[in-house]
């Protein structure tokens, strides 16, 4: 007894096509590109029916249903727009990812299409959604010429500035990603095994302001070449935050130096350092203060410290800054803060130095402030961030 002639479902075809189908004859259904086999609610990888001896097929005809990529992933710090139509997620539908303007940026154009494999796919063939990376190095600060001592910072001047509070100590750091803080190893060394006891505040100008964004450390990474109490070589550390902070006008990462940045940190080039450390009056600053200071000649700086503190070495991993006449320097409590420079080409600020050490007499004539030379540690920073997660570091020339 023959089985009834099978009729191909819409958007599908049958093979083989026969004049008559008898016992044990079979046919398969194939869907055209962009459609999938569906039996009720169940997607099938393949479909073959067999003619039974009672003249019926052993299974009902499936349908060829348009591929549905489903709702796209949410985009942290961004959003997705449906281009084809509201909530349309089927084959060849188009969506557009975009990041929150000003503070986040996307490497791709953000356009994704629902493809036949059921994945949202970018024009480059990427199946994963894009990432909104924080913009770095935007500031309202302008280099202010001949200032003696410090000046109070204004909102948006140093949005990367981070206050690190221990039970009895205070230091600084610089946000370099939405969940990484760069600081000096000596400033967090005692906390390395008890990261959670470090209180991290950002988005503030007043040191004691109650309106701060709180961040908690997950782990502290001290440079393996740093030896506590035996000089300040490799005085650099990274703090991974438990959660990503939201980037805005008062909280933003500073950029890391690109390779070409070395030319912007030559002798007499001006950088800026900010902090809540001791001021000329010998008291901790209530308001975030900053000072614009020139890079000092490395040989001069080395000679000064050889004379002042025999056995303390100014290494090639350090840079010195300050005036021969003195008066402009970082001081105790500023440790770990960033010495930043403006990249004229990109108009972004990058971290060139980390407040490390100096003369006991801050700002004394002929006694420079010594900073960790960040450009020497880019591979170390990138390695830590890529191995321990939470997004890549920000080189401002990417933007």
């Amino acid at each position: 007894r023959p089985c009834p002639d099978p009729t191909a479902p819409p958007n599908g075809s049958i093979s083989p096509v026969q004049a008559i189908y008898v016992l044990k004859d079979r046919f398969s259904v194939f869907c055209k590109t962009g459609f999938e086999l569906l039996q009720g609610s169940v997607p099938l990888k393949s479909f073959t029916a067999v003619c039974q001896k009672d003249g019926s097929w052993d299974r009902p005809m499936p349908e060829c249903s348009i591929i549905d990529c489903g709702p796209p992933d949410d985009l942290p710090n961004g959003h997705v727009d449906y281009i084809t139509g509201p909530e349309v997620t089927t084959y060849k539908a188009v969506i557009q990812y975009s990041c929150e303007e000003t503070f986040y940026t996307m490497s791709s154009n953000g356009k994704y299409v629902c493809e036949a494999d059921g994945f949202w796919t970018s024009s480059k063939g990427e199946k994963l959604p894009p990432v909104c990376e924080p913009v770095c190095g935007l500031s309202t600060h302008t280099i202010g010429g001949q200032i003696v001592g410090g000046q109070p910072a204004k909102p948006g001047d140093f949005p990367w500035q981070v206050l690190l509070l221990g039970q009895t100590t205070a230091a600084a750091g610089a946000l370099i990603h939405d969940n990484w803080v760069l600081t000096a190893a000596h400033a967090v060394y005692e906390k390395r095994m008890a990261a959670s006891s470090l209180n991290i505040r950002m988005g503030i100008l007043k040191r004691l302001s109650p309106h701060y964004t709180q961040a908690w450390p997950e782990e502290i990474f001290i440079h393996e070449g740093y030896t506590h109490g035996a000089g300040f070589d490799n005085d650099i550390a990274l703090i991974k935050l438990k959660n990503k902070v939201t980037i805005n006008g008062s909280i933003m990462p500073v950029c890391l130096p690109r390779k070409e940045a070395a030319s912007l940190m030559r002798t007499d080039f001006t950088g800026t350092v900010a902090g809540w450390g001791l001021t000329q009056k010998g008291l901790l600053a209530r308001n975030l203060m900053f000072v614009d200071i020139p890079i000092a000649d490395h040989q001069k700086c080395t000679a000064v410290y050889e004379k002042l503190y025999p056995g303390v070495r100014v290494s090639a991993n350090m840079l010195c800054a300050g005036l021969e006449t003195g008066g402009k320097d970082a001081c105790r409590g500023d440790s770990g803060g960033a010495l930043v420079f403006l990249d004229n080409e990109t108009q972004r600020w990058f971290v060139g130095g980390i407040v490390s050490w100096g003369s006991i007499n801050c700002g004394a004539a002929d006694q420079y402030g010594v900073y960790t030379k960040v450009i020497n540690y880019i591979p170390w920073i990138e390695n830590i961030i890529s191995n321990f997660g939470g997004g890549g570091s920000h080189h401002h020339h990417h933007h």
Epitope: Q39, G40, S41, V42, P43, K45, S46, R59, D68, G118
Partner: antibody, heavy 118, light 107 residues
Framework: QVQLQESGPGLVKPSETLSLTCTVS??????????WGWIRQPPGKGLEWIGS???????YYNPSLKSRVTISVDTSKNQFSLKLSSVTAADTAVYYC??????????WGQGTMVTVSS | SYELMQPPSMSVSPGQTASITCSGD??????AYWYQQKPGQSPVLVIY???KRPSGIPERFSGSNSGNTATLTISGTQAMDEADYYC?????????FGGGTKLTVLG
Amino acid sequence: QVQLQESGPGLVKPSETLSLTCTVSGGSISSSSYYWGWIRQPPGKGLEWIGSIYYSGSTYYNPSLKSRVTISVDTSKNQFSLKLSSVTAADTAVYYCARDRRGRFDPWGQGTMVTVSS
Amino acid sequence: SYELMQPPSMSVSPGQTASITCSGDKLGDIYAYWYQQKPGQSPVLVIYQDNKRPSGIPERFSGSNSGNTATLTISGTQAMDEADYYCQAWESSTGVFGGGTKLTVLG
């Protein structure tokens, strides 16, 4: 965001009929994209699919339970229901309702514990 | 009736890769689905149609299915991944679940 909520008696006597309702909020049960399913989980054991229904009323059931199961839909109330007859202690379980989108159950209700005991 | 078999339990150290298997006759010919269930909570879909991740599921979850075995892989396993994991498939329009695997994250 669609949410599902199971409701019904927590205690049923042996040989009686277990009746549960799942209320769908944040989306229409009449969407052509979805079936709606029931799954259960006896205490400390694994998951067992009971059956699924389309808004038009077409159903498919687990063959091992088919003779005792009825799933129905009420589109006006945005609900679907489960009836399981002739229950025994072996039917004691957490009963979940879930949206069945192309064979995948997502999301699930929070589940309701039903104990069969005299 | 169709059966899906899973190892009852397995353990993994944080940061390591966990591979949970599910075996069934010619399982690779049909789609496999994976659900995560934490104590006292409803199951959550983590992989569908062998290897697709629903919105909101971390990238560390991935799936594969060929021959008689489907595998759920969790790379860089975290403490929060400790849960029961169930595979599921449809055979002749009947939903079938595996017995579940209890994943313990050590430490």
